[in-house]
């Protein structure tokens, strides 16, 4: 999917996908403007599925995607939990 | 610091369930992207992972022996645990309790417990 | 399940030796590999992750490397402290799978 490491700018990403992360199994987005030491946007998806990717900040069906989430009302109801026990 | 350490029986029989637990500290399974994990290694073969459990309860566990694992934890205690049913003498192996931590970059099983050795044996 | 075919399964070799370990994967696994270093009577440890980025104080002469579905490790000269077992592990997806091993013994 990518590489990542700690390095010296500070950034979690060293690459990133494009390829698109389905809206239903994304459980948090972490949008990091520069700062810190880090002079690029990160984007950092956890996945339900128990995973954690680093994602192209300027891919387009990011950019649909971070609009849906932030029209979305903060008091809208939360998805039903997917099922708990997994043959993995 | 963060340690991790094994402890169930050192010998049981054929049939029986095999106990484990996980004692930890220098982490908690409460915050978002904490988890505990299981994998085992019989004498001088290859490693196994047997089952995962997350701060949210999220269980794993390897398809290839489901029927037979349950993992589970207490939060409040530090404590993660796997039961295995109905053990037969190719259950014997060292078992490790491991960490993973939801971060990116992602390295699961980044710490690892000392191991704690099981025999099956009639 | 994704397999991953480690070889060789053991192997001897001489203080100052380069030596490389592969791992094949039954399928695409983009990176996600671990490489980790089981010294005799301890607990494995990470040693390479995401296939190519040194662990927190793994020596400079440990690296990893991607060819398609190959991925290898690499000791670029041999010391004695790196006598162990060598483990690959794809966390792409459930169930993580390991390699079979590696020991690496002194010639």
């Known amino acids: 999917i990518l590489e990542a490491h700690y390095t010296n700018l500070k950034c979690r990403c060293s690459g990133v996908i494009s390829t698109v992360v389905g809206l239903n199994i994304i459980d948090r987005i972490q949008v990091t403007p520069p700062g810190n030491g880090c002079p690029k946007t990160e984007v950092v998806i956890w996945t339900k599925m128990k995973k954690v990717i680093c994602v192209n900040p300027r891919a387009k069906w990011l950019q649909r995607l971070l609009r849906h989430v932030q029209s979305k009302s903060l008091s809208s109801t939360p998805q039903a939990p997917v099922s708990k026990r997994r043959a993995a | 610091q963060v340690t991790l350490k094994e402890s169930g029986p050192e010998i049981l029989q054929p049939s029986q369930t095999l106990s484990l637990t996980c004692t930890f500290s220098?982490?908690?399974?409460?915050?978002?992207?904490?988890?505990v994990g299981w994998i085992r290694q019989p004498s001088g073969k290859g490693l196994e992972w047997l089952a995962n459990?997350?701060?949210?309860?999220?269980?794993y566990y390897n398809p290839s022996l489901i029927n037979r694992l349950t993992i589970s934890k207490d939060t409040s205690n530090n404590q993660a645990f796997l039961k295995i049913t109905n053990v037969d003498t190719t259950d014997s192996a060292t078992y490790y309790c491991?960490?993973?931590?939801?971060?990116?970059?992602?390295?699961?099983?980044?710490?690892w417990g000392q191991g704690v050795m099981v025999t099956v044996s009639s | 399940d994704i397999q991953m075919t480690q070889s060789p399964s053991s192997m001897s070799a001489s203080l100052g030796d380069r030596v490389t370990i592969t791992c094949q994967a039954s399928q695409d696994i983009e990176n996600d590999l671990i490489w980790f270093q089981q010294k005799p009577g301890k607990s494995p440890r990470p040693l390479i992750y995401y296939a190519t980025n040194l662990a927190n104080g793994v020596p400079s002469r440990f690296s990893g490397r991607r060819s398609e579905s190959n991925y290898s490790l690499t000791i670029s000269s041999l010391e004695s402290e790196d006598m162990a077992d060598y483990h690959c592990?794809?966390?792409?997806?459930?169930?993580?799978?390991f390699g079979a091993g590696t020991k690496l013994e002194l010639k």
């Open positions: 220098g982490f908690s399974l409460s915050p978002y992207g904490m988890g």
């Open positions: 592990l794809q966390f792409k997806q459930y169930p993580y799978t």
């Open positions: 459990i997350w701060w949210d309860d999220d269980k």
């Open positions: 491991v960490r993973s931590e939801l971060v990116m970059p992602y390295v699961p099983f980044d710490y």
